[in-house]
């Protein structure tokens, strides 16, 4: 079911159109559902979800992560700073979502849906942001070389990278969701 068309709600007459905040909330939860499906396949396929060797692979990645200074946590919450961080982080995740595209067998469509839904989410959030100048877009050349590097890893590292991207993206989105609900 696409976001904004929760199957429970389809038959409800005279539904109020979704507000911008509700649309963003639904969009994030839709992406999170997609990530859950992808993580299920990853965890069933390998023991990566239980692995203690994550630190080895994590060193090669520079995955976006929320920190206190970003203003998205309950302590030191700052709406504008946080929104910039969310958009910047999502833009940085795009290259990793591109990497995921050939990493799934039974959930190939789900991986594409997560990628495309994230692009839509970024557009929603950019409309909400006042300070678009503060948002830095990743360099395409850097992204291209990163993608090549990730794809050249051995099988074990590729599996670990897939697991870490999904875990980090889930965490980032859930932190974003909590923060956006305060705005």
């Amino acid at each position: 079911v696409p976001p904004g068309e929760d199957s429970k709600d389809v038959a409800a007459p005279h539904r109020q159109p979704l507000t911008s905040s509700e649309r963003i909330d639904k969009q994030i939860r839709y992406i999170l559902d997609g990530i859950s499906a992808l993580r299920k396949e990853t965890c069933n396929k390998s023991n990566m979800c239980e692995s203690s060797k994550e630190a080895l692979a994590e060193n090669n990645l520079n995955l976006p992560k929320m920190a206190e200074k970003d203003g998205c946590f309950q302590s030191g919450f700052n709406e504008e700073t946080c929104l910039v961080k969310i958009i910047t982080g999502l833009l940085e995740f795009e290259v990793y979502l591109e990497y995921l595209q050939n990493r799934f067998e039974s959930s190939e469509e789900q991986a594409r849906a997560v990628q495309m839904s994230t692009k839509v989410l970024i557009q929603f959030l950019q409309k909400k942001a006042k300070n678009l100048d503060a948002i830095t877009t990743p360099d395409p050349t850097t992204n291209a070389s990163l993608l090549t590097k990730l794809q050249a890893q051995n099988q074990w590292l590729q599996d670990m990278t897939t697991h870490l991207i999904l875990r980090s993206f889930k965490e980032f989105l859930q932190s974003s969701l909590r923060a956006l609900r305060q705005m």
């Epitope: 429970k8 939860r29 979800c49 239980e50 929320m66 998205c72 965490e171 859930q174 932190s175 909590r178």
Partner: antibody
Framework: QVQLVESGGGLVQPGGSLRLSCAAS????????MTWVRQAPGKGLEWVSS????????AYADSVKGRFTISRDNAKNTLYLQMNSLKSEDTAVYYC????????????????WGQGTQVTVSS | DIQMTQSPSSLPTSLGDSVTITCQAS??????LSWYQQKPGQTPKLLIY???RLQTGVPSRFSGRGSGTSFTLTISGLEAEDLATYYC?????????FGQGTKVELK
């Protein structure tokens, strides 16, 4: 099977400190949000604090903000609650709870609860 | 902060009755609502999450409905083991908040 075992409760004077621990077993601790919930004698449930899996993101009830600190040690499968400047109204049974979720569910809800540890603040 | 108003606080009933408890949020919480059962001297137990999803192992006589600001928990055909206090919890935004509780007891 999933087990949550709280410890560290006891009798403390107003203004004093206590550190509660919750030892978790039977699941991949690092994958789950964890929460402290308390219940004063004869009263209802009160959400106290939550800590999220890897982000270090924490949240507190207004009644404990600035006095309590939640933390976790994923290597030791342990959740903590450092309670400072304790008041008589902090007297309660403190429950350690696991949030639904891990790999799949994204919604909130506490599916496993420890037996609780009694904290009494009295002079 | 989002306030949760649960009613009634006490519900005298008879075995076999259908029982409905209501939880009202002061602003929209989407479907981020869960319901808990607590029997005297026991730890709370999750019944419903996501407003309407039945937790594994919970009897199907329990059901949850609602979205936005208004939510209900229904027990269809009350059994003796259902006599307890029930709480709702909003998990939408900080600080999360429980309802005041509803004690389901015999008349």
């Amino acid at each position: 099977q999933v087990q949550l075992v709280e410890s560290g409760g006891g009798l403390v004077q107003p203004g004093g400190s206590l550190r509660l621990s919750c030892a978790a077993s039977g699941f991949t601790f690092s994958n789950y949000y964890m929460t402290w919930v308390r219940q004063a004698p004869g009263k209802g449930l009160e959400w106290v604090s939550s800590i999220y899996s890897f982000s270090g993101d924490t949240a507190y009830a207004d009644s404990v903000k600035g006095r309590f600190t939640i933390s976790r040690d994923n290597a030791k499968n342990t959740l903590y609650l450092q309670m400072n400047s304790l008041k008589s109204e902090d007297t309660a049974v403190y429950y350690c709870t696991r949030n639904l979720g891990g790999v799949v569910v994204t919604t909130n809800g506490y599916d496993y609860w420890g037996q609780g540890t009694q904290v009494t603040v009295s002079s | 902060d989002i306030q949760m108003t649960q009613s009634p606080s006490s519900l005298p009933t008879s075995l076999g009755d259908s029982v409905t408890i209501t939880c009202q949020a002061s602003q929209s919480i989407s479907d981020e609502l869960s319901w808990y059962q607590q029997k005297p001297g026991q730890t709370p137990k999750l019944l419903i999450y996501g407003a309407s999803r039945l937790q594994t192992g919970v009897p199907s006589r329990f059901s949850g409905r609602g979205s936005g600001t208004s939510f209900t928990l229904t027990i269809s055909g009350l059994e003796a083991e259902d006599l307890a206090t029930y709480y709702c919890l909003q998990g939408y935004s900080w600080p999360f908040m429980f309802g005041q509780g509803t004690k389901v007891e015999l008349k």
